[in-house]
């Protein structure tokens, strides 16, 4: 009886249990009761990868630089070529037939694994104790920058996306903010000594006066070592010094009393 | 159903050439198999003479020397025999065949 | 060339006896693929020779399982269970294995 079913690496055809070809051939002619199935060596641009009975050999994949695409691994008579992505690029499937540019990981997250020829790049957010304030797509989470080591203090908690911001400790804040602060007060207590003199040396307003021709007062004459006769400075608002014009008295009149 | 059918002289004079034509119906002869000549000689020994393949190539038996050789015309599906410088050995009856499948058997005699 | 030699020449059987015949060639008949191209014919009183086994022992197509074939490398057996009157004839062996192909000198089935 013919066979119904034929060995490993064979086919039915006609009743008959053939050959298969083996990979790198395609079949010619099938076997017959007197002969051998009959194959033949894949071209150069062709090939087979499993016994079979194909009676023509599959064109190798052409890897098209427009797509992105490079050759990985030249193709055989028994493999097909193998392409992969251009630098900066991956493959779109798992069959590679086009390339598309690898993805960055947005601020707040960092590269978890680099992209290669044939995967994406991985993205993982940033945890706690590390940031990223770049979009990338080689950078990782960077780890917040250790204030203690450089013997200073936080002074803006980090996030995912920024870095902590560190400042001086308190004892060197202290040897910053004291002097300032004896600066501020020293001015304070100048300009109290100042307002307290000119309160006192005003006349009293219940004694009767005779009617008077308006009089210049000299601020200055009180101040110890001041010279009425010497032009100084003047200081404006903005705390700049202004020359005193020469030829002119540092004198202020003062209105004649109703 | 695959069919054989010769045709050819009966008798031929030594020296000469032995042509026979072989008809095939019901299977093209480029689509496989080998297409041979045998020949039978009296008292029934059989001898394989060669075989033209489907692709059209030849296999002849190395006893034949140069004597033989096997054509086709793929139009009409025939293959041929020719042998040449025939002596009174030469007479036999001779078959085309595919193997699984025979012709009738052409009865040919060198005779002068 | 590879030697095919058959025996017995003659085999007188009674119907419905088993008959075996034999068939050795000078060399393996296996080849590299482990396919062994042995074939056995009968060849009926006026007729042409027609195929009964293929590849040592597949029975060509309507062949009755009346008839089976073994062996293998140069040592081959045709055998026929219960003979029948339709059995008689000369019975040949021959390879495909290696050119030139060859044939065996034939075994004549007779009635005893």
């Known amino acids: 009886e013919p066979p119904t079913a034929c060995r490993e690496k064979q086919y039915l055809i006609n009743s008959q249990c053939c050959s298969l070809c083996q990979p790198g051939q395609k079949l010619v002619s099938d076997c017959t009761e007197f002969t051998e199935t009959e194959c033949l060596p894949c071209s150069e641009s062709e090939f087979l990868d499993t016994w079979n009975r194909e009676t023509r050999c599959h064109q190798h994949k052409y890897c098209d630089p427009n797509l992105g695409l490079r050759v990985q691994q030249k193709g055989t008579s028994e493999t097909d070529t193998i392409c992969t992505c251009e630098e900066g690029l991956h493959c779109m499937s798992e069959s590679c037939e086009s390339c598309v540019p690898h993805r960055s990981c947005l601020p707040g997250f960092g590269v978890k694994q680099i992209a290669t020829g044939v995967s994406d790049t991985i993205c993982e957010p940033c945890p706690v104790g590390f940031f990223s304030n770049v979009s990338s797509a080689f950078e990782k989470c960077r780890p917040w920058t250790s204030c203690e080591t450089k013997d200073l203090v936080v002074q803006q908690a980090g996030t995912n996306k920024t870095d902590v911001v560190c400042g001086p400790q308190d004892r060197q804040r202290a040897l910053v903010v004291i002097p300032i602060c004896l600066g501020i007060l020293f001015v304070i207590l100048l300009l109290v000594l100042v307002f307290i003199k000119k309160v006192a040396k005003k006349p009293n307003d219940k004694a009767p006066h005779p009617k008077q021709e308006p009089q210049e007062i000299n601020f200055l004459d009180d101040l110890p070592g001041s010279n009425p006769a010497a032009p100084v400075q003047e200081t404006l608002h903005g705390c700049q010094p202004v020359t005193q014009e020469d030829g002119k008295e540092s004198r202020i009149s003062v209105q004649e009393r109703q | 159903e695959v069919k054989l059918e010769q045709s050819g002289p009966g008798l031929v004079k030594p020296s000469q050439s032995l042509s026979l034509t072989c008809s095939v119906t019901?299977?093209?002869?480029?689509?496989?198999?080998?297409w041979n000549w045998i020949r039978q000689f009296p008292g029934n020994k059989l001898e394989w003479m060669g075989y033209?393949?489907?692709?059209?190539?030849?296999n002849y038996n190395p006893s034949l020397k140069n004597r033989i050789s096997i054509t086709r015309d793929t139009s009409k599906n025939q293959f041929f025999l020719k042998l040449n410088s025939v002596t009174t050995e030469d007479t036999a009856t001779y078959y085309c065949?595919?193997?699984?499948?025979w012709g009738q058997g052409t009865s040919v005699t060198v005779s002068s | 060339d590879i030697v095919m030699t058959q025996s017995p020449l003659s085999l007188p059987v009674s119907l419905g006896d088993q008959a075996s015949i034999s068939c050795r060639s000078s060399?393996?008949?296996?080849?590299?693929?482990?396919?062994?191209?042995l074939n056995w014919f009968l060849q009926k009183p006026g007729q042409s020779p027609q195929l009964l086994i293929y590849?040592?022992?597949n029975r060509f197509s309507g062949v009755l399982d009346r008839f089976s074939g073994t062996g293998s490398g140069t040592d081959f057996t045709l055998t026929i269970s219960r003979v029948e009157a339709e059995d008689l004839g000369v019975y040949f062996c021959?390879?495909?294995?290696?050119?030139?192909?060859?044939f065996g000198s034939g075994t004549k089935l007779e009635i005893k």
């Open positions: 065949a595919r193997l699984d499948y």
């Open positions: 019901g299977y093209s002869i480029t689509t496989n198999y080998y």
């Open positions: 033209i393949n489907y692709d059209g190539s030849n």
């Open positions: 060399q393996s008949l296996e080849n590299s693929n482990g396919n062994t191209f």
């Open positions: 590849k040592v022992s």
């Open positions: 021959l390879q495909v294995t290696h050119v030139p192909f060859t």
